[in-house]
């Protein structure tokens, strides 16, 4: 059974959170998909998704978040710029299949930003402040409204935590084993 | 021990197919991505693809769409990698590489296997 | 895709030189590069990540420098164990690609 995981990211302001969701490239590869933020007790909210059809690795930016589909490789490359405190929370891609309900990808990111300068040994001082150059032809997309009511009958864990669940389906209920994530810049 | 061990060297005719396995030991295997590099003698290195042993999810590079397949069996913490439609030009050492977390834009290799040479020659 | 050229393809050094290896990539990388060595019938090894971030266990006299386009990396007093290939590798868009590599050799 593949395990949904929740993984933990620690960074300081300014800096830029880096990752990437997986998907079955045959299903999804001209899927829309979206990033959205899980609030305790809230529906999760769309803060940016890729056009309808999604156009391979062509760089959606709606704010400080960036979007790029790798539609031949099955990777939806995230990255929030310039990281404030208040970006802290549990994010999580999706990808849209209407009339269907948005199809939850792995792995869910657990985000939390402080302020000061990361002087954590392993992280790239060097790049903490990058400013990602992102080509003029970058498109802002509209994303769909609705969301998934199966993603909003309980509230997600809060701790950092591998769940188990069987291939495709979601089941936040058995919470096992915290896992820690090194700082990533 | 930190490690990644794979299968023994291979001799094919063209047209037929291979199999590498790569058995990973010392860490959470479905923590991180698996990757496929492979080297032609006295030649640079060649990105294939990448696993996600967790999801089972792959990507390959356009050069290999369609003719390689990536696979894990995570019972046994292994990554296979199979190439059909062999030719003379396949010939090369392929190594399976340990990248970032699952999660992480962080595609460095920081752990290799030994590599497995495959000789395709009628 | 991003193209790597790296320069030379080879060198021969004297044992003590200071060894300087280009990479230059086709376009911006943000930073996303990493340095490997590979010694004959040995499987490559990753130095140096993200430009200038040593790997664990990685002795000090290697290092590395750049931004943009332009990257280099540095031996700072060549030693015979030193003797190898030497690959960059960027990871800002896939697919990955490496450079050709630079062959180091000992006069």
């Known amino acids: 059974a593949t395990k949904l995981t929740e993984e933990k990211y620690e960074l300081k302001e300014g800096q830029t959170l880096d990752v990437k969701c997986d998907y079955t490239l045959e299903k999804f590869a001209s899927s829309q998909k979206a990033w959205q933020i899980i609030r305790d007790g809230e529906m999760p909210k769309t803060l940016a998704c890729t056009e309808r059809p999604s156009k391979n690795s062509h760089p959606v930016q709606v704010g400080r978040i960036i979007l790029e589909d790798y539609h031949d490789h099955g990777l939806l490359r995230v990255r929030m710029v310039n990281l404030q405190v208040e970006d802290s929370g549990l994010y999580q891609c999706v990808i849209y299949q209407p009339p269907k309900e948005p199809h939850m990808l792995f792995d869910r990111i657990r985000l939390v930003v402080t302020k000061g300068f990361s002087g954590t040994p392993g992280s790239n001082e060097n790049s903490t402040q990058n400013v990602y150059k992102i080509p003029p032809t970058t498109t802002k997309a509209l994303c769909p409204l609705y969301t998934s009511p199966r993603t909003v009958t309980q509230a997600p864990p809060k701790s950092t935590a591998d769940v188990s669940t069987p291939d495709s389906e979601i089941n936040l209920t058995n919470v096992t084993d915290i896992i820690r994530v090194p700082v990533f810049n | 021990q930190v490690q990644l061990v794979q299968s023994g060297a291979e001799v094919k005719k063209p047209g037929a197919s291979v199999k590498v396995s790569c058995k990973a030991s010392?860490?959470?295997?479905?923590?991180?991505?698996i990757n496929w590099v492979r080297q032609a003698t006295g030649q640079g290195l060649e990105w294939m693809g990448w696993?996600?042993?967790?999801?089972?999810?792959?990507g390959q590079t356009q050069k290999f769409r369609g003719r390689v397949t990536m696979t894990r069996d995570t019972s046994i913490n292994t990554a296979y990698m199979e190439l059909s439609s062999l030719r003379s030009e396949d010939t090369a050492v392929y190594y399976c590489?340990?990248?970032?977390?699952?999660?992480?834009?962080?595609?460095?290799?920081?752990?290799w296997g030994r590599g497995t040479l495959v000789t395709v020659s009628s | 895709d991003i193209q790597m050229t790296q320069s030379p393809s080879s060198l021969s050094a004297s044992v003590g030189d200071r060894v300087t290896i280009t990479c230059q990539a086709s376009?911006?990388?943000?930073?996303?590069l990493n340095w490997y060595q590979q010694k004959p019938g040995k499987a490559p090894k990753l130095l140096i990540y993200?430009?200038?971030n040593l790997e664990t266990g990685v002795p000090s006299s290697f290092s590395g420098s750049g931004s943009g386009t332009d990257f280099t990396f540095t031996i700072s007093s060549l030693q015979p164990e030193d003797i190898a290939t030497y690959f960059c590798?960027?990871?800002?868009?896939?697919?990955?690609?490496f450079g050709g590599g630079t062959k180091v050799e000992i006069k």
């Open positions: 993200d430009v200038s």
């Open positions: 590489a340990r990248g970032g977390y699952t999660s992480a834009w962080r595609w460095y290799f920081d752990l």
């Open positions: 590798q960027q990871y800002d868009k896939l697919p990955l690609t």
């Open positions: 376009q911006d990388i943000n930073n996303h």
């Open positions: 696993l996600n042993p967790n999801s089972g999810n792959t």
């Open positions: 010392g860490y959470t295997f479905t923590r991180y991505d």
